[in-house]
Interface confidence: low
């Protein structure tokens, strides 16, 4: 299939940034947002700045997503949630895989069975409710440049 | 009903300026981005340009750039294109279209067009 | 000139299925899952028929369907109706966060 434009980061050298994108969520068309308290949700508005965010290859198919404007990382907790953090600890590590249907996936890196996720009115999954297939978990990466 | 009023087309000469409008009606304007559209005689559909639903975010095909400005006021459920500088090759019925939620580029709702003609 | 290239026309005969291709690049059809096809009647505006490759908005016909591999997007109509004459176009969102049309396809129903 043919991959979404930069969309994977699993051919860049650890700590490569690529240009900022914005993920949007194939689940009810949210782009995911990480506000400057820490909050993650979805949104529909294309240009909100906190959409904005920059995927670091930390390793061979492994990232981590920080919100451009709010200076923050996104971090699974013990618990389920997602929120982002001032700084990048091991909860802020994601696997990200191209799935067949050109949509990516999050999954945590520490809670390997979870996956960064949204539901349709826009609020963000907890971890322990996701699962491979839904279309909760399913992400497009899009360009940022503007 | 949802509904798309363009309005402001006509005959004006190469450089001058034209201000088309668009009303919005049965739907909730200001929840919206817009874009229009532009189809010359007997051609295709050329995008010419997009207003996030705040007005912060636009962008212009090339074509355009520098001599449009998209605009809109929510208040007033009113979408705008100043055109400065028109060319011959600005001829076209111009649409405005609506922005289908979450999505990029797929326009649901469109107006019936209003006609701009560029000659001397 | 078109950015997306289509076929200027097709035909068919009622009850037959027709399919139109939309070639792009990688920076727009192949990169993104944001391909639209819109139904043109003369001295009508388009109307939304596909977007997201393969939704159809409500009130669209099912006999109205997309699909994508690689850098072509293809619409389909089967079971040709009289009324389905009129010209189509695809879009596609860009790398630079534009959108282009296809140069627009005649459909004749024979």
């Known amino acids: 299939p043919a991959l979404p434009e930069d969309g994977g980061s699993g051919a860049f050298p650890p700590g490569h940034f690529k240009d900022p994108k914005r993920l949007y969520c194939k689940n009810g068309g949210f782009f995911l947002r990480i506000h400057p308290d820490g909050r993650v949700d979805g949104v529909r508005e294309k240009s909100d700045p906190h959409i904005k965010l920059q995927l670091q290859a930390e390793e061979r198919g492994v990232v981590s997503i920080k919100g451009v404007c709010a200076n923050r990382y996104l971090a699974m907790k013990e618990d389920g949630r997602l929120l982002a953090s001032k700084c990048v600890t091991d909860e802020c590590f994601f696997f990200e895989r191209l799935e067949s249907n050109n949509y990516n996936t999050y999954r945590s890196r520490k809670y390997t069975s979870w996956y960064v996720a949204l539901k349709r009115t826009g609020q963000y999954k907890l971890g322990s409710k996701t699962g491979p297939g839904q279309k909760a978990i399913l992400f497009l990466p899009m360009s940022a440049k503007s | 009903q949802v509904q798309l009023q363009e309005s402001g087309g006509g005959l004006v000469q190469p450089g001058g300026s034209l201000r088309l409008s668009c009303a919005a009606s049965?739907?909730?304007?200001?929840?919206?981005?817009m874009n229009w559209v532009r189809q010359a005689p007997g051609k295709g559909l050329e995008w010419v340009s997009y207003?996030?639903?705040?007005?912060?975010?636009?962008y212009y095909a090339d074509s355009v750039k520098g001599r449009f400005t998209i605009s809109r006021d929510n208040a007033k459920n009113s979408l705008y294109l100043q055109m400065n500088s028109l060319r011959a090759e600005d001829t076209a019925v111009y649409y405005c279209?609506?922005?289908?939620?979450?999505?990029?580029?797929?326009?649901?709702?469109w107006g019936q067009g209003t006609m701009v003609t560029v000659s001397s | 000139q078109s950015v997306l290239t289509q076929p200027a026309s097709v035909s068919g005969s009622p009850g037959q299925s027709i399919t139109i291709s939309c070639t792009g690049t990688?920076?727009?059809?192949?990169?993104?899952?944001?391909v639209s096809w819109y139904q043109q009647h003369p001295g009508k505006a388009p109307k939304l028929m596909i977007y997201?490759?393969?939704n159809r908005p409500s009130g669209v016909s099912n006999r109205f369907s997309g699909s994508k591999s690689g850098n072509t997007a293809s619409l389909t109509i089967s079971g040709l109706q009289a009324e389905d004459e009129a010209d189509y176009y695809c879009?596609?969102?860009?790398?630079?966060?534009?959108?282009?049309f296809g140069g627009g396809t005649k459909l004749t129903v024979l």
């Open positions: 049965g739907f909730t304007f200001s929840s919206y981005e």
């Open positions: 207003i996030s639903s705040s007005g912060s975010t636009i």
């Open positions: 879009s596609s969102y860009t790398s630079s966060s534009t959108v282009v």
């Open positions: 279209a609506r922005e289908l939620t979450g999505d990029w580029g797929a326009f649901d709702i």
């Open positions: 997201d490759v393969s």
């Open positions: 990688s920076s727009d059809v192949g990169g993104y899952n944001y």
